[in-house]
């Protein structure tokens, strides 16, 4: 059918609670173009009446609420005036319920819902929320094992829980609880937490530091073959993961069925006070539809990305 | 390291109760659930329940419910097993286990406690 | 409930054979939710084998687990003298938690 076919992951899903996923994938949603969003290759389009429990709202596919037997491979379709892409999007929901029974508990983390508080700092946690507009969502409640947050170290802001001269004692599981409105009606969002705490290292802080990309840009020819490095300083003992990530789906995972562009092997060498990580990225032959995409180099809490363009042209 | 320390084998009589303890160290307490099981002897592993340290929220084994209660002191990080109206076929030994979150399974187990229910 | 039914109730093998446990469900297990426990007397369980094949901490690769919905497997490539116990199933997934009945892995 003409449409070029791309491939992400997105498991980490509750049941019983809205989910919305935004059919995003620059540059090609930023000009002219459709979505539309299918489940399991159906033909038939997902509905866009808004009392529907699984409606399309926008580019965004919306789930009020999600519930178990919504697993499945959902593909949005991007037609613009001379192209098509198609994102599958592997959704995998899982039951939590973390606070009245650890039966059926949590599958493995995705990063959203792993953070990282640095010892003796101020510093906050996100509660990550992505719904369409038409979704209001009221203000956010705060959770540490199981109990409601309370404290002067502790302040609510935005989608953010602010902790002052974070101790020992802050790490746990945190849960954030909004109550999302839609159509007049109301739904619970509760999106579980896991919190270490990090202490700053000798050579200048434990968050890792990307020594490069710098969020900068590669001029590159269409159809060329190109590597990348991520160099990274941390300490000797972390325990940071490295990677490369596009659209916040690893690399090698997006890139599943082609396997066009894959991240290498990890390196490292080692100095007295840290160690220098070097991960790369491999575009096989680089597509029109990398131009302007973030290709984010992740180390622990930090990240960094490049973006690729087109060299401009010569008029000499 | 992580350590689930049980109390001592204890005998009782039948109709009497039983309230087993489980020190942990290691870990903050409050943070994971804490599973209790049982284990006649020569027989396989029966799960009584799980209390939540922090809420004090537990769940029962239909089997065990309204003979079994699951209480914990934060402030000595131990948790406690009691069962009441004792009858032979309790006697066994029962283990504390710890579950972390996001990983459903028992990684740590305490030692065991044997009851004996003999007149 | 779940029912785990392990076999057989007693394996006789000697050091160096390979040796196959089984743990059959009532109904489906997800992966995720099937775990191995390893028993020898006078102690407390040990976990194993979790998520159906991932070994736990210091397990030797000479076991694995294998298996999905209602048939599970821990194989033991070729058996040491220290691997003779009792080793039990175990899921996750839905109240009231279950074991099997326990596979004896005995010397012959």
């Known amino acids: 059918d003409g449409c070029n076919d791309i491939f992400m992951k997105n498991e980490m899903l509750s049941a019983s609670q809205p989910f919305a996923f935004n059919c995003t994938f620059p540059p090609i949603t930023s000009g002219e173009v459709s979505v539309t969003w299918y489940k399991n290759s159906s033909k038939i389009p997902v509905s866009k009446i808004i009392q529907s429990r699984i409606h399309q709202d926008e580019t965004w596919i919306l789930f009020l609420p999600m519930e178990w037997g919504d697993s499945g491979v959902y593909q949005c379709v991007i037609k613009g005036r001379d192209s098509c892409h198609r994102i599958h999007v592997n959704l995998t929901v899982f039951e939590k319920q973390w606070c009245d029974t650890s039966v059926k508990g949590l599958p493995n983390l995705s990063d959203e819902y792993k953070q990282i508080l640095h010892l003796g700092k101020d510093d906050s946690l996100t509660c990550h929320l992505h719904f369409p507009k038409s979704c209001i969502l009221g203000p956010i409640k705060w959770y540490k094992d199981c109990n409601e947050i309370t404290g002067e170290r502790f302040t609510v802001l935005e989608t953010r829980l602010l902790v002052s001269n974070v101790s020992a004692e802050d790490r746990g599981n945190y849960a954030c609880q909004v109550i999302l409105t839609h159509s007049g009606k109301q739904y619970e969002v509760l999106n579980g937490i896991t919190v270490s705490i990090t202490e700053r290292a000798g050579y200048g802080g434990s968050v890792p530091k990307i020594i490069y990309p710098k969020n900068n840009s590669i001029e590159v020819q269409l159809g060329t073959t190109l590597i990348v490095d991520c160099n990274i300083t941390d300490t000797k003992d972390n325990t940071n993961l490295r990677c490369w990530r596009v659209n916040n789906t690893l690399v090698d995972d997006y890139y599943n069925e082609s396997k066009r562009i894959r991240e290498g092997v990890e390196t490292h060498a080692s100095f007295r006070e840290y160690n220098l990580y070097t991960v790369n990225i491999t575009f096989l032959e680089v597509k029109m539809e990398d131009y302007g995409l973030p290709f984010m180099c992740h180390a622990g809490v930090s990240a960094a990305y490049i973006m690729l363009q087109l060299p401009a042209p010569d008029f000499r | 390291q992580v350590q689930l320390v049980q109390s001592g084998a204890e005998v009782k009589k039948p109709g009497a109760s039983v309230k087993v303890s489980c020190k942990a160290s290691g870990y903050t307490f409050t943070s994971s659930w804490m599973h209790w099981a049982k284990q006649a002897p020569g027989q396989g592993l029966e799960w009584i329940g799980e209390i939540h340290p922090n809420s004090a929220k537990t769940n029962y084994n239909q089997k065990f419910q309204g003979r079994v209660t699951m209480t914990r002191d934060t402030s000595i990080s131990t948790a406690y097993m009691e069962l009441s109206r004792l009858r032979s076929d309790d006697t066994a030994v029962y283990y504390c286990?710890?579950?972390?979150?996001?990983?459903?399974?028992?990684?740590?187990w305490g030692q065991g406690t044997l009851v004996t229910v003999s007149s | 409930q779940i029912v785990l039914t392990q076999s057989p109730g007693t394996l006789s093998l000697s050091p160096g054979e390979r040796a196959t446990l089984s743990c059959r469900a009532s109904?489906?297990?997800?992966?995720?939710?099937l775990h191995w426990y390893q028993q020898k007397p006078g102690q407390a369980p040990r976990l194993w084998i979790y998520s159906t094949s991932s070994r736990a901490t210091g397990i030797p690769d000479r076991f694995s687990g294998s298996g999905s919905g209602t048939d599970f497997t821990l194989t033991i490539s070729r058996l040491e003298p220290e691997d003779f116990a009792t080793y039990y199933c175990?899921?996750?997934?839905?109240?009231?938690?279950?074991f099997g009945q326990g596979t004896k892995l005995e010397i012959k």
């Open positions: 175990q899921q996750f997934q839905s109240s009231p938690l279950t």
């Open positions: 286990a710890r579950v972390d979150y996001g990983k459903p399974w028992f990684a740590y």
């Open positions: 109904s489906s297990v997800s992966s995720s939710y």
